[in-house]
Interface confidence: low
Amino acid sequence: RKIPKVGHTFFQKPESCPPVPGGSMKLDIGIINENQRVSMSRNIESRSTSPWNYTVTWDPNRYPSEVVQAQCRNLGCINAQGKEDISMNSVPIQQETLVVRRKHQGCSVSFQLEKVLVTVGCTCVTPVIHHVQ
Amino acid sequence: GITIPRNPGCPNSEDKNFPRTVMVNLNIHNRNTNTNPKRSSDYYNRSTSPWNLHRNEDPERYPSVIWEAKCRHLGCINADGNVDYHMNSVPIQQEILVLRREPPHCPNSFRLEKILVSVGCTCVTPIVHHVA
């Protein structure tokens, strides 16, 4: 499996592009839209029929250092009576995001882009029934 | 994660904070993730709060293709397969980091950008606003 490369050869390179050593790219980590404050609307993680909890993972050698992951609270879904219905399944919904990984090798520091799979929340689905012959 | 102890003789700059601009290897370390959610699972069809997936393409961004979820119904699908409007289908939204070409069209110069995407939908008990 090929590791994807970010640089695209089909772009016409303007004169104003900064010089970049071969095999690498220049990355400004001052985030565009950094101050867009986001909060999920009014605790949907508790109101969902497939509720979830959040945990924060912390890594000082990752940028951003804080990544929030969701975990479904139940295997089944919560019915109208507030009881778990195991004829339905709570399943995680996931989304890829990019992070920058800092690596120390001796006294030198290198940076690597990494795709991270974040579990965002959960949804309630009808299970796939596998009939055993 | 644990910070790797450094040789005491190393200069101590950039230990805690990341520098504003970094040179990064063009290869992305990815965890075998699948960028097409239609291929990776059929939750969008099987959910009690089903959603459609819309392709958002931008060649000035990496990844250039992002899939956006749009809930199909205001209510949720009940056991009979009908829409129950006593419940609400709502999108689950997430901020993700992408790369934006900066300056525009440059092949190997990027800036991180935070974008908000709807990843899927979940079925919730509605908040009832009582009008006085």
Partner: nanobody
Framework: EVQLVESGGGLVQPGGSQRLSCTAS????????MGWYRQAPGKQRELVAL???????DYADSVKGRFTISRDNSKNTVYLQMNSLRAEDTAVYYC??????????????????WGQGTLVTVSS
């Protein structure tokens, strides 16, 4: 916050037509579905029609072929064109929308919002 304001209600003759409109206002980021519900005296609120951001629409069986829902995304407005009106269409018509919006620097993902309702009376 987000407000939904309906207009266009009133008294109509059986067989006549009426057009309702509903506009969403506030610091709106996206509207992924808008629609109309109605509540006749002594009855439960019921779906009339919904229109999704992609343009596809969903109608209650009782109004199919008579009512048409449309939306103008640039104006955050949804319309309900009601033709061949019957006495049983008499109800308070409520606008509903799923909206994402900013308020006080916080982003709220989509929730169901409701208008105050507009009365449509079909009578000779």
């Amino acid at each position: 916050e987000v407000q939904l304001v309906e207009s266009g209600g009133g008294l109509v003759q059986p067989g006549g037509s009426q057009r309702l409109s509903c506009t969403a206002s506030g610091t709106i980021v996206n509207i992924h579905v808008m629609g109309w519900y109605r509540q006749a005296p002594g009855k439960q609120r019921e779906l009339v029609a919904l229109i999704f951001s992609g343009g596809s629409a969903d109608y209650a069986d009782s109004v199919k072929g008579r009512f048409t829902i449309s939306r103008d995304n640039s104006k955050n407005t949804v319309y309900l064109q009601m033709n061949s009106l019957r006495a049983e269409d008499t109800a308070v018509y409520y606008c509903a929308a799923e909206i994402g919006y900013y308020s006080g620097g916080t982003y709220y993902s989509s929730e169901a919002h409701w208008g105050q309702g507009t009365l449509v009376t079909v009578s000779s």
